[in-house]
């Protein structure tokens, strides 16, 4: 439905508050280095303009596309060239090339200072003094650090952020009330950002069909009672929403997400019995709740898949005449029967089925050729099952920190060219799969673990794409979206790697380590571990364990010493010498 003024249409649909918030998110995700005040000024100008268009849709420039309006506004930033360098060249382009250019310059790892949390009283004062600015600043700081954060979901986080301050700043013990809530929001926010980053990577690097296949599998697991036509409609709508958000079209995305939530709730009887509670909530909570809703129960009397997908005489005809529909139905039918499989496994099975049909259908006896296709699935199913079993056993034996360390060593040996901060960040996140998923019963372990690993490995892929250093990483990241995890799992020690020169400075520590939080101290130790492996890639587990145990003892000893700095200087030298001897450096 065409509107005379797109900006007026979205302003009316979303309301002023959400409109302003979404424009701020959009601008902060594009111009990640711009100061908060500059963005607020731009947002206010856009909002005032939108209001004039609401009053008169025929007013000057109101017929322009949102990309044109927003792009023109971003290109008025005076410091564009000195702050962003070649990104300023985007402004010489016309739409839609200009927006594509801005998208290509989004930085997954912007050079921004770490967000330091002020004292609770300071935060509460700021919240009370100017609630609107305080919340806008939250949106701005998250959006610029996470340029692909799912914008309508960020509005939900901001609502929870506001609620936490509203409640806790009145509490007797403000810190006890607020800090756990902020920790939870931070952790959930990071997870949400990473999940959305995978969706955008899927769309941008592998195309709409890859995303749709993922969505068919996931929604079929979640809504196994829904008909294929219903799932297909939801997939089409969901794809539109995520395509818009990943493309920077945040107003359209938020509007369409609200429409999708409305549709789902109006049709929940034909979708899922689990949606009732979600659908009673306000919009932002409703959309979030639907996105996280548990899988509905599987229909009791589902027939064997073989009838339609192996035994039917029309298998090859159906495949050849409409692959998207036929393979979509296969994926739907398989996924609704297997909530115990990861989405990526289901996609691998569908790809195997497709490849087999493509190979067999032109043969003299197609049925004979593809009759055993389901037998080909067995090793594909067993591979992640065995991997998860082994790693959960290792996790239960070691605990999270040491399990992370085992993964750090494993991944540094596989891809030692990758930067140490990236290896630490990714391996720590990979290690979290243990506490996240190993507690689940067998039937929930694989979807939890393998789909989570897909999200984490995508972080590695997007960080590596910015500064490519390893052909092996590039290969695993680009060849197949669904085979990324098996590709990384299959990598052995990189025999071509030339060990890094030993640098004593890398292993020099100071008394400031003693005041760090437990998490920060772990990161310091894990950074040292990665560097050790880069110096000595052939070091055994035992050698590395001995050095790390000595290192932990050294930190503990010096942090208890009266003259900490002297202890770190003197004992540090001894530790470096002993470690070099132990590792034969």
């Amino acid at each position: 439905d065409a509107h005379k003024s797109e900006v007026a249409h979205r302003f009316k649909d979303l309301g002023e508050e959400n409109f302003k918030a979404l424009v701020l998110i959009a601008f902060a995700q594009y111009l990640q280095q711009c100061p908060f005040e500059d963005h607020v000024k731009l947002v206010n100008e856009v909002t005032e303009f939108a209001k004039t268009c609401v009053a008169d849709e025929s007013a000057e420039n109101c017929d322009k596309s949102l990309h044109t309006l927003f792009g023109d506004k971003l290109c008025t930033v005076a410091t564009l060239r000195e702050t962003y360098g070649e990104m300023a060249d985007c402004c010489a382009k016309q739409e839609p090339e200009r927006n594509e250019c801005f998208l290509q310059h989004k930085d997954d790892n912007p050079n921004l200072p770490r967000l330091v949390r002020p004292e609770v009283d300071v935060m509460c004062t700021a919240f009370h003094d100017n609630e609107e600015t305080f919340l806008k600043k939250y949106l701005y700081e998250i959006a610029r650090r996470h340029p692909y954060f799912y914008a309508p979901e960020l509005l939900f986080f901001a609502k929870r952020y506001k609620a936490a301050f509203t409640e806790c700043c009145q509490a007797a013990d403000k810190a006890a009330c607020l800090l756990p809530k902020l920790d939870e929001l931070r952790d959930e926010g990071k997870a949400s950002s990473a999940k959305q980053r995978l969706k955008c990577a899927s769309l941008q690097k592998f195309g709409e069909r890859a995303f749709k296949a993922w969505a068919v599998a996931r929604l079929s697991q979640r809504f196994p009672k829904a008909e294929f036509a219903e799932v297909s409609k939801l997939v089409t709508d969901l794809t539109k929403v995520h395509t818009e958000c990943c493309h920077g079209d945040l107003l359209e995305c938020a509007d369409d997400r609200a429409d999708l939530a409305k549709y789902i709730c109006e049709n929940q009887d034909s979708i899922s019995s689990k949606l009732k509670e979600c659908c009673e909530k306000p919009l932002l909570e409703k959309s979030h709740c639907i996105a996280e809703v548990e899988n509905d129960e599987m229909p009791a009397d589902l027939p064997s898949l073989a009838a339609d997908f192996v035994e039917s005489k029309d298998v090859c005809k159906n495949y050849a005449e409409a692959k998207d529909v036929f393979l979509g139905m296969f994926l739907y039918e398989y996924a609704r029967r297997h909530p115990d499989y990861s989405v990526v496994l289901l996609l691998r099975l569908a790809k195997t089925y497709e490849t087999t049909l493509e190979k067999c259908c032109a043969a003299a006896d197609p049925h004979e050729c593809y009759a055993k296709v389901f037998d080909e699935f067995k090793p594909l199913v067993e591979e992640p099952q065995n991997l998860i079993k082994q790693n959960c056993e290792l996790f239960e034996q070691l605990g999270e920190y040491k399990f992370q360390n085992a993964l750090l060593v494993r991944y540094t040996k596989k891809v030692p060219q990758v930067s140490t901060p990236t290896l630490v960040e990714v391996s720590r996140n990979l290690g979290k799969v243990g506490s996240k998923c190993c507690k689940h019963p067998e039937a929930k372990r694989m979807p939890c673990a393998e789909d989570y690993l897909s999200v984490v490995l995508n972080q590695l892929c997007v960080l590596h794409e910015k500064t490519p250093v390893s052909d092996r990483v590039t290969k695993c990241c680009t060849e197949s979206l669904v085979n990324r995890r098996p590709c990384f799992s299959a990598l052995e020690v990189d025999e071509t790697y030339v060990p890094k020169e030993f640098n004593a400075e890398t292993f020099t520590f100071h008394a400031d380590i003693c005041t760090l939080s437990e998490k920060e101290r772990q990161i310091k130790k894990q950074t040292a571990l990665v560097e050790l492996v880069k110096h000595k890639p052939k070091a055994t587990k035992e050698q590395l364990k001995a050095v790390m145990d000595d290192f932990a003892a050294f930190v503990e000893k010096c942090c208890k010493a009266d003259d900490k700095e002297t202890c770190f200087a003197e004992e540090g030298k001894k530790l470096v010498a002993a470690s070099q001897a132990a590792l034969g450096l």
């Epitope: 195309g207 709409e208 069909r209 090859c316 005809k317 495949y319 050849a320 005449e321 409409a322 692959k323 998207d324 529909v325 497709e354 049909l357 493509e358 190979k359 067999c360 259908c361 032109a362 043969a363 003299a364 006896d365 197609p366």
Partner: antibody, heavy 121, light 110 residues
Amino acid sequence: EVQLVESGGGLVKPGGSLRLSCAASGIDLSNYAINWVRQAPGKGLEWVGIIWASGTTFYATWAKGRFTISRDDSKNTLYLQMNSLKTEDTAVYYCTTTVPGYSTAPYFDLWGQGTLVTVSS
Amino acid sequence: AIQLTQSPSSLSASVGDRVTITCQSSPSVWSNFLSWYQQKPGKAPKLLIYEASKLTSGVPSRFSGSGSGTDFTLTISSLQPEDFATYYCGGGYSSISDTTFGQGTKVEIK
């Protein structure tokens, strides 16, 4: 030597019919997916249709109903029956095999030399 | 409607030049079902590349293909005298009935 040889082309009036043949030597056509591809004079390539080893046929949307592909295994020959011919069907018609291991992909490796069909009054 | 658009429609180049031909598909091809053919006057086409980037056996390594989804490229790294010909891309889609070719790119001697 493995080869495909088309025949049966010639001049035909609009509305008329023609049957093209594609004879194979060195390969057993019944083990292959075979396509017909045409090329109007001075123009590009256009896929007409395919017959799989099993005998199942598929056609380009524009060819459905007018063109029929068949095969005679005893003669190791493929046919293209063309009815209700139009002037725009004037072209060189090639038969070509799909690369083994594929059924629906546009990978055509072995080609005949082509036969010219002219539809004109 | 399915469209496979090649550009340029013709180009002039010299022996030793690097030549790039693009093929744009709407909608995206199915599962990288994209091929490249070479055709010389009066002859049948010859398959050079399949699955967007795989070289058919016997085809010189100066030919290479890349791309996925909607955008594909054929590159001849160093044009040889025998490479002057017309090049076609071929695309496969969800329905076999939509199999189609680009309109061709004629590579001529400068």
